[in-house]
C-alpha cells in the first residue's frame, strides 16, 4: 500500500510541478520594473522569456515579442533552453510514469518493468526539476547583477536639470513559480525513485520447497517469509512462493475499476 501511495503521490506532485514549470516558462513576469525609485510611475514594465510588456495606468497593456534570436543575450537563450529541456523531460517522465503506475494494469506488464519505468520517470522528474531551478536561478542571478549595475549609474545627467532614470528590474512572479514548481518536480521524482525500490523484485529469488506429510501439505518458504499451510485442496506439489518479493498491496485478487484506463 505504501509503495502505491508513494508512487501515486510522486506522480501527482510531479504533475503539479511540471504544470508549474510550463506556466512559469510562459509567464511574462520574469522580471518586473523596480518601483523603489519611482513608486508612482504611470507606466509599468515587465519582461518574460519570450516578450516584454508595458502596462499603463490607463489599463492598456502592450506586449512585444523578442523577434530576434541572435540579438538576444546568451544567458536568456540558456534560460529558455533549460526551461524547455525541463518541460520536455518532465512531459516524457509523466508519460512513462502513467504506464508505471501500480494502479494501472497494462496487459501482462511485469513488476520489474514497472519498477524500471518508475525509476526512469523519477530520474526524468529530478533532472526536469533541476533544469527549471537552474534556469530560474540563472535568470535571477542575471537580474541581481543588472540591478546593481544599473544602481551604480542610476542617473545619467543630461545637461544640468534634465535626467534620465534608468529602468531597474527586480524578481517577477514567474521566478517564484519556477522555483516552487522545480522543487515540486524534484520532490516528485525522488518519491518515484523511492517507490521504485519497493516495486523492484529482490535479487535473490528462492524457489519454494514443498514437504508433504501424510495428512496435509506444508509449504515451507525459506528466507524469512511466513510459511503458509494448505489444507485439502493443496495436496499436490504446488509452487506457493515464486521468489518475487511482493508486498501485500500488490496482490489484487479481482480486477478493480482502476486496473484499466
Amino acid at each position: 500500500m505504501a509503495v502505491t501511495a508513494c508512487q501515486g503521490l510522486g506522480f501527482v506532485v510531479s504533475l503539479i510541478g511540471i504544470a508549474g514549470i510550463i506556466a512559469a516558462t510562459c509567464m511574462d513576469q520574469w522580471s518586473t520594473q523596480d518601483l523603489y525609485n519611482n513608486p508612482v510611475t504611470a507606466v509599468f514594465n515587465y519582461q518574460g522569456l519570450w516578450r516584454s510588456c508595458v502596462r499603463e495606468s490607463s489599463g492598456f497593456t502592450e506586449c512585444r515579442g523578442y523577434f530576434t534570436l541572435l540579438g538576444l543575450p546568451a544567458m536568456l537563450q540558456a534560460v529558455r533552453a533549460l526551461m524547455i529541456v525541463g518541460i520536455v523531460l518532465g512531459a516524457i517522465g509523466l508519460l512513462v510514469s502513467i504506464f508505471a503506475l501500480k494502479c494501472i494494469r497494462i496487459g501482462s506488464m511485469e513488476d520489474s518493468a514497472k519498477a524500471n519505468m518508475t525509476l526512469t520517470s523519477g530520474i526524468m522528474f529530478i533532472v526536469s526539476g533541476l533544469c527549471a531551478i537552474a534556469g530560474v536561478s540563472v535568470f535571477a542571478n542575471m537580474l541581481v547583477t543588472n540591478f546593481w549595475m544599473s544602481t551604480a549609474n542610476m542617473y545619467t545627467g543630461m545637461g544640468g536639470m534634465v535626467q534620465t532614470v534608468q529602468t531597474r528590474y527586480t524578481f517577477g512572479a514567474a521566478l517564484f513559480v519556477g522555483w516552487v514548481a522545480g522543487g515540486l518536480t524534484l520532490i516528485g521524482g525522488v518519491m518515484m525513485c523511492i517507490a521504485c525500490r519497493g516495486l523492484a523484485p529482490e535479487e535473490t529469488n528462492y524457489k519454494a520447497v514443498s514437504y508433504h506429510a501424510s495428512g496435509h501439505s506444508v509449504a515451507y518458504k525459506p528466507g524469512g517469509f511466513k510459511a503458509s499451510t494448505g489444507f485439502g485442496s493443496n495436496t499436490k506439489n504446488k509452487k506457493i512462493y515464486d521468489g518475487g518479493a511482493r508486498t501485500e498491496d500488490e496482490v489484487q485478487s479481482y480486477p478493480s475499476k482502476h486496473d484499466y484506463v
Epitope: 520594473q33 519611482n38 508612482v40 510611475t41 504611470a42 507606466v43 514594465n45 519582461q47 516584454s52 510588456c53 508595458v54 499603463e56 495606468s57 490607463s58 489599463g59 492598456f60 502592450e62 512585444r64 543630461m158 534634465v162 535626467q163 534620465t164 532614470v165 529602468t167
Partner: antibody
Framework: EVQLLESGGGLVQPGGSLRLSCAAS????????MSWVRQAPGKGLEWVAT????????YYADSVKGRFTISRDNSKNTLYLQMNSLRAEDTAVYYC???????????WGQGTLVTVSS | DIVMTQSPDSLAVSLGERVTMNCKSS????????????LSWYQQKPGQPPKLLFY???TRESGVPDRFSGSGSGTDFTLTISSVQAEDVAVYYC?????????FGQGTKLEIK
Amino acid sequence: EVQLLESGGGLVQPGGSLRLSCAASGFTFSSYTMSWVRQAPGKGLEWVATIIIGGSYTYYADSVKGRFTISRDNSKNTLYLQMNSLRAEDTAVYYCTRLVKGSAMDYWGQGTLVTVSS
Amino acid sequence: DIVMTQSPDSLAVSLGERVTMNCKSSQSLLQSGNQKNYLSWYQQKPGQPPKLLFYWASTRESGVPDRFSGSGSGTDFTLTISSVQAEDVAVYYCQNDYSYPFTFGQGTKLEIK
C-alpha cells in the same frame, strides 16, 4: 456617444466640504481609469487625482493630498471627488476625464465650477 | 515631480502659416519597455474643455486634422501646425503621462494676426 457630466459644484466657504460627481455614459465605465483635472479662472490645467480601473489604486496631486478623495461606483457608472478643508486656491472648474492609451485623457466633461470664498 | 516647460508662451501668426511650439520635460518621458514617449498634447478653445490631439508624443487622436503633427523624444517635443486655420486659435498644452503627478505645461496661446 461617450458622455461625462459633472455636478456638485458651487459656492463654499473656506474649510468647507463639497462632493463632486461625474456621471459616465456611452462606454464601459468599469474598464477605464478616470481622473479629475482642474483649471483655475484664467490659468492653466492642473491634474488633481486619478483612480485606476479596479479602484484599488488612487493617486493625488501634492496640493490636494489628504484633503481630497477620489472614488468610483462602477454599478452607478459614477466618479466622485470628495473635497474637504477647501481653500481659496481650490477655486476652479473641475473636469472629469477618461484615460486611454498612453495614459492620455481622450474625453472631458464640460466641467463644474467650484468657488471657495467667504 | 516632472516639470513641463512650454515655449513660447504665446504666438501670433497669419492664416496658412506654419507654426511650431515646443515642450521640454525635466526628465525623459521615453519608456524603454516599448520605446514610446509618454507625452500628450491638448487643444483648448475659449470656453471649452480641452481636446486630446496626440498621445505617445506623435500618435494622432482620431478626428484630428492631419495638418497637426507631433514629434520629439526623450525630453524635447514639438507640436507643428503645417497651415494654421482660424479654428486653430486656442491654448495648447503638453502633459507628462509618464509618472504621477501628471503635470501640464503652462500652455502656448495661438492667435491669428
